[in-house]
Amino acid sequence: TMCSAQDRTDLLNVCMDAKHHKTKPGPEDKLHDQCSPWKKNACCTASTSQELHKDTSRLYNFNWDHCGKMEPACKRHFIQDTCLYECSPNLGPWIQQVNQSWRKERFLDVPLCKEDCQRWWEDCHTSHTCKSNWHRGWDWTSGVNKCPAGALCRTFESYFPTPAALCEGLWSHSYKVSNYSRGSGRCIQMWFDSAQGNPNEEVARFYAAAMHVNAGEMLH
């Protein structure tokens, strides 16, 4: 079942109300490296895009290397995930209101293309972590996330035995793994070549339309 984005009528070309997002999407010529596909229309600034590529960036003081050095092939997926989170103006249909000190809105159940999830898991399952949900439960006493007492570092595969366990569990169901494939127009791509435009615009349009139809049916 599709959930409606609570109280939001503007589901297309919108930015989430969160810590570093712009209030209105627009061009950002100087987006850095992995965030550059969103140059033509972005919810992130160039400085945010620059900062999120750093280890333990000032954006969230989040340390990817909490269990030793994360493999570069793995880390690039987390950078791309953060680019999508900070920069995408095409996630309106999945915005939900939350009562958190650091943000008023979050994404929930964004349908991530199955290949993007599979590749993320394959590239990460030999890196190490100590938790299966990275939203909560960390030891923040040092100002940076550390493994809580007694939480053992093990391979990603131990904490995330399947691709879905990673993509859906990691950020408390911000994503759900779609049965659709990249290029179908029915799932969000974390990775895309902007030379062909942003494929996620079409996906947002499809789900926004479906949500309006559903909302209409509920009214009658």
Partner: antibody, heavy 118, light 108 residues
Amino acid sequence: EVQLVQSGAEVKKPGASVKVSCKASGYTFTSYAMHWVRQAPGQRLEWMGWINAGNGNTKYSQKFQGRVTITRDTSASTAYMELSSLRSEDTAVYYCARDISYGSFDYWGQGTLVTVSS
Amino acid sequence: SSELTQDPAVSVALGQTVRITCQGDSLRSNYANWYQQKPGQAPVLVIYGQNNRPSGIPDRFSGSSSGNTASLTITGAQAADEADYYCDSRVSTGNHVVFGGGTKLTVL
């Protein structure tokens, strides 16, 4: 570079106890589990037990329950395995090993030969 | 039972492919890990989890599993592969670990 360095060989009398140490370096000691495995001459590897180096929780093989005690000193990044009531069948090389995935041991100590002889 | 069973000895011609197997009930719900041990040395992890090779392990080593049987395959065996090979696996009840009896691999 991850290293596990064990204490030297020991010769013990039957009925005595032995305590083997395993000093870890090159990683955050408290973030990983440490296991102990032994191998009698010409025999298979035999799992003895493990310790969560973060909180000190332990699990022991049924076979050694009551005779083995695994401890750790976080300030020294060192794990210890003590085996009591030694008998000749306990003559073996004792290894410590770091666990990365429920029994996947990616780094091993060099081994400590314990000989039990009257 | 929490036993893991391996063939005591297996031989392979230089350059050929060999499969070493490990059987046990715990393998129905847990992956096997594989270790290579040469005389007088500590074991070395060669395959763990689904089919993961630690860095430095040649890609001629691979792992697979089906039902209660796990297999280690060496494709194009080298003289340096002559060693004892042990499987182990987690026993879910109680978070214990069990080792197989070991397989002595001879490269002819």
